[in-house]
């Protein structure tokens, strides 16, 4: 694989949002031959899925640049190597009165489709993003966020819900995916791995990132989440990958510094309001989008996923704090709280930018394998 090359005039350089130094791409294998990340503990394979070599226990392959920029997801290398079997981290499951199949977990039984049949649906999340197969859609305009810069008061509830750390957001955070596609932010939560093991939910060319943030939104067409579940576009999630960088991320520190207070499952604390948009990448114009599902039971479909191309940088210490502080069910550490990537089953991921175009001198002509389905919208 080629060495990373620096792009000094990168429009995404600067700021604390991440790296944007493009990596060289090799010829990509076909989708059928693409390596798939190892299933995380806790979810049985859906019918037809194979156990393929994983990459969780391999050292991460990514450039270490002293200059700030943003990693271009579409140019990440594919890691192909046999992975050691991953030991479930959350394999203790306490027996309690009233315990039933709805008490799902990442560590094993019950199989998620038994908890909710929708988890065996055909259009599930997360997925592996293959930029070369993404459809460039010029109609996908920059995301619009309004009211995300919150004042310190009122304070917000930060809770360890046993599956993640969740920040409940107040009314008034408005987000638009485009004209007539308006949403209200409800909450945000994170997914992570364990020491030396990445834990993002989505992957790019099989590459799993250290962590991932999800900001969950409800369409303004609905008053309540239960009304929107399973309805196309009823829910929308903004997702961004978290990566290791040289500096502490001050926005994230406002949350990470409080995790010790909510180490126990079910515990919560109040944190001052903060700039929620500062937790996301700064470039709202470059992203991938597809229709999928909630990544936890009940796995309801119809969720619009928007995955930022730009990543967010946290220090190594911050990523360690995230993955090594909280406790989940059964007195087990809350780690590796990500679902296995799910088959696209014919879905085409759209991109707001020409992600599949190889900009290297090697390419005689741009390569774009899928056309935009939303042209003219």
């Amino acid at each position: 694989q080629r060495l990373p090359r620096m792009q000094e005039d990168s429009p995404l350089g600067g700021g604390s949002s991440g790296e944007d130094d493009p990596l060289g791409e090799e010829d990509l294998p076909s989708e059928e031959d693409s390596p798939r990340e190892e299933d995380p503990p806790g979810e049985e394979d859906l019918p037809g899925e194979e156990d393929l070599p994983g990459e969780e226990d391999l050292p991460e392959v990514k450039p270490k640049s002293e200059e700030e920029g943003s990693l271009k997801l579409e140019d990440l290398p594919t890691v192909e190597a046999p992975g050691d079997p991953q030991e479930p981290q959350n394999n203790a499951h306490r027996d309690k009165e009233g315990d039933d199949q709805s008490h799902w977990r990442y560590g094993g039984d019950p199989p998620w489709p038994r908890v909710s049949p929708a988890c065996a649906g055909r259009f599930q999340s997360p997925v592996d993003i293959r930029p070369q197969l993404a459809a460039f859609c010029p109609a996908l305009r920059p995301l619009e966020l309004l009211g995300f810069q919150l004042p310190p008061l009122p304070e917000l509830r930060l809770r360890n819900n046993g599956h993640s750390v969740q920040l409940t957001l107040p009314p008034g955070l408005e987000m638009a995916l485009g004209p007539g596609r308006e949403y209200r932010a409800l909450q945000l939560h994170l997914h992570w791995g364990a020491a030396g093991r990445p834990g993002s939910e989505h992957t790019v060319e099989g590459h799993r990132f250290p962590a991932e943030i999800h900001v969950v939104h409800l369409s303004t067409a609905f008053a309540r989440v239960d009304e929107a579940l399973g309805r196309p576009g009823g829910l929308a999630v903004l997702a961004a990958f978290l990566e290791e960088g040289p500096e502490e991320n001050s926005a994230y520190e406002q949350l990470l510094s409080r995790l010790e207070e909510i180490a126990e499952e079910g515990s919560e604390t109040q944190v001052p309001g903060l700039d929620i948009s500062a937790l996301l990448p700064s470039d709202f114009s470059r992203y991938f989008q597809y229709e999928g599902s909630l990544t936890t039971p009940p796995c309801a479909q119809g969720v619009i996923w928007t995955v930022f191309n730009q990543t967010v940088m946290l220090s190594a210490k911050q990523l360690h704090t995230l993955s090594d502080t909280l406790w989940g069910p059964g007195d087990s550490r809350l780690q590796l709280n990500f679902r296995a990537t799910q088959p696209l089953n014919g879905r085409v991921i759209e991109a707001s930018f020409p992600a599949g175009v190889d900009s290297s001198p090697r390419a005689a002509e741009p390569v774009q394998l899928n056309s935009c389905l939303a042209a003219g919208d």
Epitope: R94, K96, G98, D99, D100, S102, H103, W104, R105, R159, N161, G162, H163, Q166, T168, L186, Q187, V216, L218, R224, V225, D226, E227, L229, L235, E264, E265, G266, T296, P297, P298, G328, P329
Partner: nanobody, 117 residues
Framework: QVQLVESGGGLVQPGGSLRLSCSAS???????????MAWYRQAPGKGLELVAV???????QYSSSVKGRFTISRDNSKKTLYLQMNSLRAEDTAVYYC????????WGQGTQVTVSS
Amino acid sequence: QVQLVESGGGLVQPGGSLRLSCSASGGARNIFSFAAMAWYRQAPGKGLELVAVITSAGGTQYSSSVKGRFTISRDNSKKTLYLQMNSLRAEDTAVYYCNADYYQDYWGQGTQVTVSS
């Protein structure tokens, strides 16, 4: 449309017991099993106070003022949340609210608990 309905409140003497129930109706039934459930209370002239939480996996947390006296539990098959309150004190007098946290907060209308001799 009522989503969460509390019951079981009433007048009780100090040292007595009550069991509160919170039943999910309508669309809230669909998300009950996946929600973190909680009891909050509001005493006269005071703010909302978290009493107890139970996660979807059954993990529980209690405020220091009720720990050892109150027990939160849930029956997902019945879509019902419970709060067993023992050794009640005058300072437990409040309106008790049921809360479901599933991407957004769902609230009940509240049930009055009065502890008085």
